[in-house]
């Protein structure tokens, strides 16, 4: 028998992916075990095998179809169970009633880009995906800017409450490099979370023109 | 609706190697647990091996432990199962099966199956 304090979290990403992470101390490494989802009111099912992270943690995918398709809705509830193999038996470790729009997390965006960068400034844009359409406008961004001798935690973030999929960033240094990075949270669900930050955009200011007056 | 296609099938004998391979379409593959099963002439189909959604944990019935060997590469969207010292009792219609849930992929009822390839082996 597995002894200790177990966590189960799950996130759906709006379409057709619900992430799980299962912590289990004093679990064995070496032991299968598996996610089982169970719709209310849906006719699949689906597992997937959980795989060690670090000592004591694992994670796995519930790949519910294609990377696009809405296949959950506001009113579905998951039946999710942590499901471990002792000898010839499964045992359920965890259970929750997973509500998918209570429990977001969406992917992060993805194709940033630099639309036009000056000396003091820059704009960028950048795309979400798999998102539901459910959502419509109801979505709010944070960015950062990454600046020469700090790190991402010191940079302050900037918040867009509402669904604007670009950016002007001001009072930049000319001729400098830079690092910018976005992440997306839908406003419904009670346990929702922001998305994993986007990869870096990497740019670089104009530099100041010499000779001009300022 | 997820296609699945088994190749790789042929004559033996004794003592030798095949290796079947299942190409599997229309849906995404790494959903899938993956199975095989087998069909002599006159008896049920039955279970051989069981591969998970990750390809991590794999499971065999009995009489093929140790000579057969199930994997699959997610990224061609196949499932292989390669089988050394075959015996005239492996004589069989071997087929590929996937479904969504591996705690029901041993029950027949609710899977996908390819069409089947042939395996003889002779004494």
């Known amino acids: 028998a597995v002894n200790g304090t177990s966590q189960f979290t799950c996130f759906y990403n709006s379409r057709a992916n619900i992430s799980c992470v299962w912590s289990q101390d004093g679990a064995l490494q070496d032991t299968s075990c598996q996610v089982h989802a169970w719709p209310d009111r849906r006719r699949w099912n689906q597992t997937c095998e959980l795989l060690p992270v670090s000592q004591a943690s694992w994670a796995c995918n519930l790949i519910l179809g294609a990377p696009d398709s809405q296949k959950l809705t506001t009113v579905d509830i998951v039946t999710l169970r942590v499901l471990c193999r002792e000898g010839v038996r499964w045992r359920v470790m965890a259970i929750q009633d997973f509500k998918p729009f209570e429990n977001l997390r969406l992917m992060a965006p993805i194709s940033l880009q630099v639309v036009h960068v000056e000396t003091h400034r820059c704009n960028i844009s950048w795309e979400i995906s798999q998102a539901s359409h459910y959502f419509e406008r109801h979505l709010e961004f944070e960015a950062r800017t990454l600046s020469p001798g700090h790190t991402w935690e010191e940079a302050p973030l900037l918040t867009l409450k509402q669904k604007q999929e670009w950016i002007c960033l001001e009072t930049l240094t000319p001729d400098t490099q830079y690092e910018f990075q976005v992440r997306v949270k839908p406003l419904q669900g009670e346990f929702t979370t922001w998305s994993p930050w986007s990869q870096p955009l990497a740019f670089r200011t104009k530099p100041a023109a010499l000779g001009k007056d300022t | 609706q997820v296609q699945l296609q088994e190749s790789g099938g042929g004559l033996v004998q004794a003592g030798g190697s095949l290796r079947l391979s299942c190409v599997v379409s229309g849906d995404v593959f790494v959903r899938y647990t993956m199975a095989w099963f087998r069909q002599a002439p006159g008896k049920e189909r039955e279970f051989v091996a069981v591969?998970?959604?990750?390809?991590?944990?794999?499971e065999y019935v009995d009489s093929v432990k140790g000579r057969f060997t199930v994997s699959r590469d997610n990224a061609k969207n196949t499932v292989y199962l390669q089988m050394n010292n075959l015996k005239p009792e492996d004589t069989a219609v071997y087929y590929c099966a996937a479904n969504t849930d591996y705690f029901q992929i041993r029950s027949v009822d609710n899977n996908a199956w390819g069409q089947g390839t042939q395996v003889t082996v002779s004494s």
């Open positions: 591969v998970t959604d990750s390809g991590r944990t794999t």
